[in-house]
């Protein structure tokens, strides 16, 4: 079972120094600051799921050296920044979508000995990202999001 933590009850102030090992900002309708880093030097798990995020400002994640799990499920991401993707030890949780192609390519080219990358469909099934991209995001196909027509991995 994944570790979890409760979300802060107050409005998020990005100037705050967060000391916890787990931060839950899920479903808050947040917009991430473009030129400001999250101050959370101990954080292992950061949950940003369900925030309607399209972009991931690379500066926001710059100082999260201890980050191991980044939950971005249920965000309509348009792309994943190469600098974030190049963090080989970062476990990214995201919906299956062609926007993850850059993440897959950067990992493939920069990270050796990695476990297979996964993505999640709308019914919360895991898929092999490589297989998803191959089937759903081949040149000429319309942009896709997770649909459930692929092999399930448990």
């Amino acid at each position: 079972q994944e570790p979890s933590c409760t979300m802060p009850s107050t409005d998020v102030d990005w100037n705050t120094e967060f000391s916890a090992t787990c931060l839950n900002f899920s479903g808050r309708g947040l917009s991430l600051p473009l030129n400001q880093s999250l101050r959370a030097s101990n954080v292992l798990l950061l949950d940003l799921s369900g925030n309607g995020l399209r972009e991931l400002p690379v500066t926001f994640f710059a100082h999260l050296q201890k980050l191991e799990v980044l939950n971005l499920l249920h965000n309509p991401l348009s792309r994943v920044d190469g600098a974030l993707a190049a963090r080989c030890d970062l476990d990214l949780r995201a919906d299956c979508s062609c926007a993850l192609e850059s993440w897959h390519e950067v990992r493939r080219d920069n990270c050796s000995g990695q476990k297979p990358l996964l993505c999640w469909d709308t019914t919360s099934f895991q898929h092999n990202l490589s297989a998803f991209l191959e089937v759903s995001c081949a040149p000429g196909l319309a942009p896709a999001t997770g649909s459930g027509h692929h092999h399930h991995h448990h």
């Epitope: 570790p3 090992t21 201890k66 191991e68 799990v69 030890d89």
Partner: antibody, heavy 125, light 107 residues
Amino acid sequence: QVTLKESGPGILQPSQTLSLTCSFSGFSLSTSGMGVSWIRQPSGKGLEWLAHIYWDDDKRYNPSLKSRLTLSKDTSSNQVFLKITSVDTADTATYYCARRPRDYYGGGHWYFDVWGAGTTVTVSS
Amino acid sequence: DIVMTQSPKSMSMSVGERVTLTCKASENVGTYVSWYQQKAEQSPKLLIYGASNRYTGVPDRFTGSGSATDFTLTISNVQTEDLADYHCGQSYSYPFTFGSGTKLEIK
């Protein structure tokens, strides 16, 4: 097989500096996510976390002792060191080092999966 | 600092009985709680992490549950080899803290 072993002086006098060594095998402290903590236990009492050193040499200390603690590591020789200055009889305890692993599947957890057998330290005049 | 309060301080049980140990955190720690077993003259051994995940090789009679501030370690069919001190610890926020322990005695 992961093992950790603590060593120390056994007995020392008040106001002296306590130097502890944790020698480990079966893992590398250069692996992302890996870390080692020092935890102590006075006889018949509970556990007290003292300090943690990360793979990237970042350190965290218990604020109640921070001014007296110095943590370091030698990655190549698989050792972690803790110094405690100005010891007092209250520092009499068994000192343990313990590993915080990085989960290959599903990171984000924090726990100590392997502990050393401990080294007993007595502060007495 | 987050205070972890364990209860009871000690308990005496017969083989085969069900044991429930509790740990209460002074503030919300999510599921960042571990349970350790410490037998006499030995170092602690990990039983449960993430509040409910049984560590490799730990018998399935040990079960952890809870989240936020209230946590429980249950031993469903206590055995003589379970005679030990049991410690809960939180790793949600520095400084990490432990409870004072529960001593389990076997009748």
